[in-house]
Amino acid sequence: IGLLYPFPRDCSQAMLNGDTTSGLYTIYINGDKTQALEVYCDMTSDGGGWIVFLRRKNGREDFYRNWKAYAAGFGDRREEFWLGLDNLSKITAQGQYELRVDLQDHGESAYAVYDRFSVGDAKSRYKLKVEGYSGTAGDSMNYHNGRSFSTYDKDTDSAITNCALSYKGAFWYKNCHRVNLMGRYGDNNHSQGVNWFHWKGHEYSIQFAEMKLRPSNFRNLEGRRKRA
């Protein structure tokens, strides 16, 4: 029997093909076989089908990187990594996506889901759209909605200072952050660490964080597959 999606455009389509184990998969932007991209799929969280695009877990990867690195992506998809703004922009241009953020620390966990998530193109400096919060972590991303991405060598924030430089990370900074998931791992100094303000504040660096996305209509697609 042929696959439902011979060239899956995201992890949800890979899952609908019958792949239910979390791990590395190849997806194809716009279903185009010439635009292959290796991604890590989370097939378990809240029904699965998520493309993980950020993971922090041990501090082994350096996240204090320049614009070029954040545009392209870096790290090991099985460990700590950033998928890349160019990839995020292309993926979210395929349709309507939702964002999920999973946070864990010393046995505690929290999550945030945003119904509508997109990253603009390079021309917009990868402008963030994030709306429709639900979850237990608190709505910290709302503050960053509408912001362009900033790195230490490309300052697009609204602060007097360079936020990426001040807080040794990169993000859709405003003035400066409520979320700093690309901050310095394990650094509990004010605003310097891996922060999600409305969960653990700015003086605590969270041990584990993942950001992931899947189509907003995934549940409908999943239900259709089960009925079929």
Epitope: D139, Y143, G146, I160, N175
Partner: antibody, heavy 120, light 107 residues
């Protein structure tokens, strides 16, 4: 243009209730968190309460917690403040205010205020 | 709660002079600091947001600076219409708190 108009203020006895309203126009109301800020006669500004765009999250100053309830009706573009167990120290001009974007943000639009006087 | 301390409380100043108002937060607030102007009988008006960003329509003689705990509002050359009370506000965390105000009046 963007506008906020408060109403519902008046003279009320201690222990009684009052409901303030704020009618919004000129912007997509449910996209923005809204707040109430008050100013006692001759005094400074005091933040009272805030509510998220969806109405799902609410916040209160300690001085009003348990007595005041903030709510909104996005279909009517309206914000409300239900004030129960009123005290003399609640006497103030009450302003509703719109945030620039997120919940904890600057207040870029303010109403003209509605006066609440609590006295026997 | 974060306490905001403004100084001075009153500032008699001649027209044309430079005005500097300071605001200090009781804890680190990054740049989550806003400035408002209020004239008698009127609602407050946003001047500066995020410590240094001029609100649309506000004259360029107003400027803001600072980060962390110490912030400044500057009026480069005081105009007659600038006589008012100025408030700082932290929007770092709930409850959002205001300074006690600085009244700028005619000297």
């Amino acid at each position: 243009q963007v506008q906020l108009v408060e109403s519902g203020g008046g003279l009320v006895q201690p222990g009684r209730s009052l409901r303030l309203s704020c009618a919004a126009s000129g912007f997509t109301f449910d996209d923005y968190a809204m707040h109430w800020v008050r100013q006692a006669p001759g005094k400074g500004l005091e933040w009272v309460s805030g509510i998220s765009g969806s109405g799902g999250s609410t916040y209160y100053a300690d001085s009003v917690k348990g007595r005041f309830t903030i709510s909104r009706d996005n279909a009517k573009n309206s914000l409300y403040l239900q004030m129960n167990s009123l005290r003399a120290e609640d006497t103030a001009l009450y302003y509703c205010a719109k945030v620039m974007s997120s919940m904890e943000d600057a207040f870029d639009i303010w109403g003209q205020g509605t006066m609440v006087t609590v006295s026997s | 709660d974060i306490q905001m301390t403004q100084s001075p409380a009153s500032l008699p100043t001649p027209v044309g002079d430079r005005v500097t108002i300071t605001c200090r937060a009781s804890q680190y607030i990054q740049g989550f600091l806003n400035w408002y102007q209020q004239k008698p009988g009127k609602a407050p008006k946003l001047l500066i947001y995020d410590a240094s960003n001029l609100e649309t329509g506000v004259p360029s003689r107003f400027s803001g600076s600072g980060s962390g705990t110490d912030f400044t509002l500057t009026i480069s050359s005081l105009q007659p219409e600038d006589f008012a009370t100025y408030y700082c506000q932290q929007s770092y965390s709930t409850p959002q708190t205001f300074g006690q105000g600085t009244k700028v009046d005619i000297k």
